[in-house]
């Protein structure tokens, strides 16, 4: 999968989206890593 | 309301460095990664590198290491980008980006900041 | 790195126009394909982003498709504030790449 920093800002978006916001505050693209997903 | 705000214009001479800055507001702005990206008169888009402002984390354009440098300042929500040994082909619009997902999912660019390289 | 090659480089077209951009990647991309809007003296705007996905306030007559090497970015209707030139961009490697632009002017 794609791990450049814009790919991750954009599957953590779309996670994001599906959950409805209800994700952990921390949960940012700067503190993700690609393997998180 | 999002902003980035980059600084004023520079004429330097070959040889020199320069150093832009992009302020950001409306934002949390560890949370977002931070693009640079350059224009020459009449050319294309090209990518000059991108920072983690949270851990200070750089990616660079090979095409750029060693010449730019990819900095930011925490506390003051600011982003900047260094370029060094200019040459008169670095004459160009530099631009900061970030897409941020937190208040409003898009792609948002600063002003840009005209860096004239001439003797 | 990573190609991007748009075409066509420029065009004319009326308002209501449907008008189509391509762009081909050398490489497999993906969907990790945007595209932007540049006006003269303006910063770029975006408009999609994984190929097909509109941001926000981007209004509908704008399309993106494809997947892999080649992506399309259609204005089903052409409108005045539409004349611009447009770019693509993949960020599925880096270094990221940007396309060489399409011109898009009144006939």
């Known amino acids: 999968a794609c791990d450049t920093a814009t790919c991750v800002t954009h599957r953590l978006a779309g996670l994001l989206s599906r959950s409805g916001g209800v994700v952990k505050n921390n949960f940012v693209p700067t503190n993700v890593g690609s393997k998180a997903f | 309301e999002v902003q980035l705000v980059q600084s004023g214009a520079e004429v330097k001479k070959p040889g020199a460095s320069v150093k832009v800055s992009c302020k950001a507001s409306g934002y949390t702005f560890t949370d977002y990664y931070m693009n640079w990206v350059r224009q020459a008169p009449g050319q294309r888009l090209e990518w000059i590198g991108d920072i983690n402002p949270n851990t200070g984390g750089t990616n660079y354009n090979q095409k750029f290491k060693g010449r730019a440098t990819l900095t930011v300042d925490k506390s003051a929500s600011t982003a900047y980008m260094e370029l060094s040994s200019l040459r008169s082909e670095d004459t160009a619009v530099y631009y900061c980006a970030s897409i941020i997902i937190v208040p409003n999912y898009f792609d948002y660019w600063g002003q840009g900041t005209t860096v004239t390289v001439s003797s | 790195d990573i190609q991007m090659t748009q075409s066509p480089s420029s065009l004319s077209a009326s308002v209501g126009d449907r008008v189509t951009i391509t762009c081909k990647a050398s490489?497999?991309?993906?969907?990790?394909v945007a595209w932007f809007q540049q006006k003269p003296g303006k910063s770029p705007k975006a408009l999609i982003y994984?190929?097909?996905y509109r941001y926000s306030g981007v209004p509908s007559r704008f399309s993106g498709s494809g997947s892999g090497t080649d992506f399309t970015l259609t204005i089903s209707s052409l409108q005045p504030e539409d004349f611009a030139t447009y770019y693509c961009q993949q960020y599925n490697n880096y270094p990221y790449t940007f396309g060489g632009g399409t011109k898009v002017e009144i006939k």
């Open positions: 994984s190929a097909s």
């Open positions: 490489q497999n991309v993906d969907t990790n």
